[in-house]
C-alpha cells in the first residue's frame, strides 16, 4: 500500500524539520489561535510520513522529483521523492540529484570533466509520468556544458527551473525544455483541470509569479468550460 511504501522511506524521503535533524524531539504547535507561522511544528518528530503531492517535478524541491511511490501502485498518485544519486537508475534528468543527469538509464555526473565543449545526449523526457514519452521515441538534444555552471537566460536549454535565471522557469518547448519567463499579471496561464493534462503540452507555460494565481478571466465567466481563458491575477 501507499502507506507502507512511504513509511518504509519515511525519513529518507522527508526533509528534516526546520531547525533540527529528522526525528528531533520537541515542542507543540503554537497556542496562538488561528495563526499559521513558519516551522510551527519544527521540532516535531517525523515517525509518520508527510507526502507532498505533485503533478510535475517543478513542484518538488531541487533534491527531489515527482513520481508515483510504487510501481503499479495507486494510479495517479504522485508525490515528491528523494532524488537519485550518481550511478543509480533513472528514467529522466529530474530524477537525478543536482550535478547529475540521466544518461542511458543511469545518473551520471554533469561536472566539467563530463562536458568538454558540447556533447550530444539523449533526453528521454517523460510526459505526465515516469514511463512514457509523447510518442515513445527519445529526442536528441545538444546541451552546452555552460548550462550546468551559469544560470540560463531566456531560451537556454534547461533540465530544471534551478538551471534558469531569476524570473524564469524551465518549461517544455517541443521535446526539449528551455528557460521561459514566469508569468506576470494579466498574462494567459494554463489551468490543469484533468490529472496528467500537463503532460500533453509541448509548449508549456511557466507558472504565475509570486502573489498571482491562475484564474478565469472576469469577462469569460459565461463562456463554456472548454473555452474559458485563464490569466494570472492578484489575490
Amino acid at each position: 500500500t501507499l502507506n507502507s511504501v512511504l513509511n518504509s522511506n519515511a525519513i529518507k524521503n522527508l526533509p528534516p524539520p526546520l531547525g533540527g535533524a529528522a526525528g528531533h524531539p520537541g515542542s507543540a504547535v503554537s497556542a496562538a489561535p488561528g495563526i499559521l507561522y513558519p516551522g510551527g511544528n519544527k521540532y516535531q518528530t517525523i515517525d509518520n510520513y508527510q507526502p507532498y503531492p505533485c503533478a510535475e517535478d517543478e513542484e518538488c524541491g531541487t533534491d527531489e522529483y515527482c513520481a508515483s511511490p510504487t510501481r503499479g501502485g495507486d494510479a495517479g498518485v504522485q508525490i515528491c521523492l528523494a532524488c537519485r544519486k550518481r550511478r543509480k537508475r533513472c528514467m529522466r534528468h529530474a530524477m537525478c540529484c543536482p550535478g547529475n543527469y540521466c544518461k542511458n538509464g543511469i545518473c551520471v555526473s554533469s561536472d566539467q570533466n563530463h562536458f568538454r565543449g558540447e556533447i550530444e545526449e539523449t533526453i528521454t523526457e517523460s510526459f505526465g509520468n515516469d514511463h512514457s514519452t509523447l510518442d515513445g521515441y527519445s529526442r536528441r538534444t545538444t546541451l552546452s556544458s555552460k548550462m550546468y555552471h551559469t544560470k540560463g537566460q531566456e531560451g537556454s536549454v534547461c533540465l530544471r527551473s534551478s538551471d534558469c535565471a531569476s524570473g524564469l522557469c524551465c518549461a517544455r518547448h517541443f521535446w526539449s525544455k528551455i528557460c521561459k519567463p514566469v508569468l506576470k499579471e494579466g498574462q494567459v496561464c494554463t489551468k490543469h483541470r484533468r490529472k496528467g493534462s500537463h503532460g500533453l503540452e509541448i509548449f508549456q507555460r511557466c507558472y504565475c509569479g509570486e502573489g498571482l494565481s491562475c484564474r478565469i478571466q472576469k469577462d469569460h465567466h459565461q463562456a463554456s468550460n472548454s473555452s474559458r481563458l485563464h490569466t494570472c491575477q492578484r489575490h
Epitope: 526533509p15 511544528n41 531541487t62 500537463h198 489575490h235
Partner: nanobody
C-alpha cells in the same frame, strides 16, 4: 503574520459527515501544496490527505481513502476536507498545513512549513 480561519470541526455520530475548511490570508498559498494532518490523544500527529497547488494531484492515508476528499479553491485561498462515513477512530485534532513551494521558491525539499492551529473532530459511536 499569516492568519488562518478554520471551520467545520465538531461532534458527529459514527457514519456522519463533516467538512473542514482552512482559509489562509497574508501569504500566497496558491502555489503551494496543502494538507491535513490529525493527532489523536496520546498518539503522534499523522498524515490524512494533501493536494498539490493546482488541485491535479491528491494523496490520502490508507485509513481515510474512499471516505475523505481533499479539495482547494485558489481564488479563495482555501483548502477543504470533506469527511464522510466517519468512524470513532477518526476522533482527533485536525491540523491544516501549507507547503513551501519547492524548487520554485528555492527549496531543496518540498515540505509543510506552515501549520495551523488544530480543530477538534469528535466521532461518537
Amino acid at each position: 503574520e499569516v492568519q488562518l480561519v478554520k471551520s467545520g470541526g465538531g461532534l458527529v455520530q459514527a457514519g456522519g459527515s463533516l467538512r473542514l475548511s482552512c482559509a489562509a490570508s497574508g501569504r500566497t498559498f496558491s502555489s503551494y501544496a496543502m494538507g491535513w494532518f490529525r493527532q489523536a490523544p496520546g498518539k503522534e500527529r499523522e498524515f490524512v490527505a494533501a493536494i498539490n497547488w493546482s488541485g491535479s494531484s491528491t494523496v490520502y492515508a490508507d485509513s481515510v481513502k474512499g471516505r475523505f476528499t481533499i479539495s482547494r479553491d485558489n481564488a479563495e485561498n482555501t483548502v477543504y476536507l470533506q469527511m464522510n462515513s466517519l468512524k470513532p477512530e477518526d476522533t482527533a485534532v485536525y491540523y491544516c498545513a501549507a507547503g513551501n513551494g519547492g524548487r520554485n521558491y528555492g527549496h531543496s525539499r518540498a515540505r509543510y512549513d506552515y501549520w495551523g492551529q488544530g480543530t477538534q473532530v469528535t466521532v461518537s459511536s
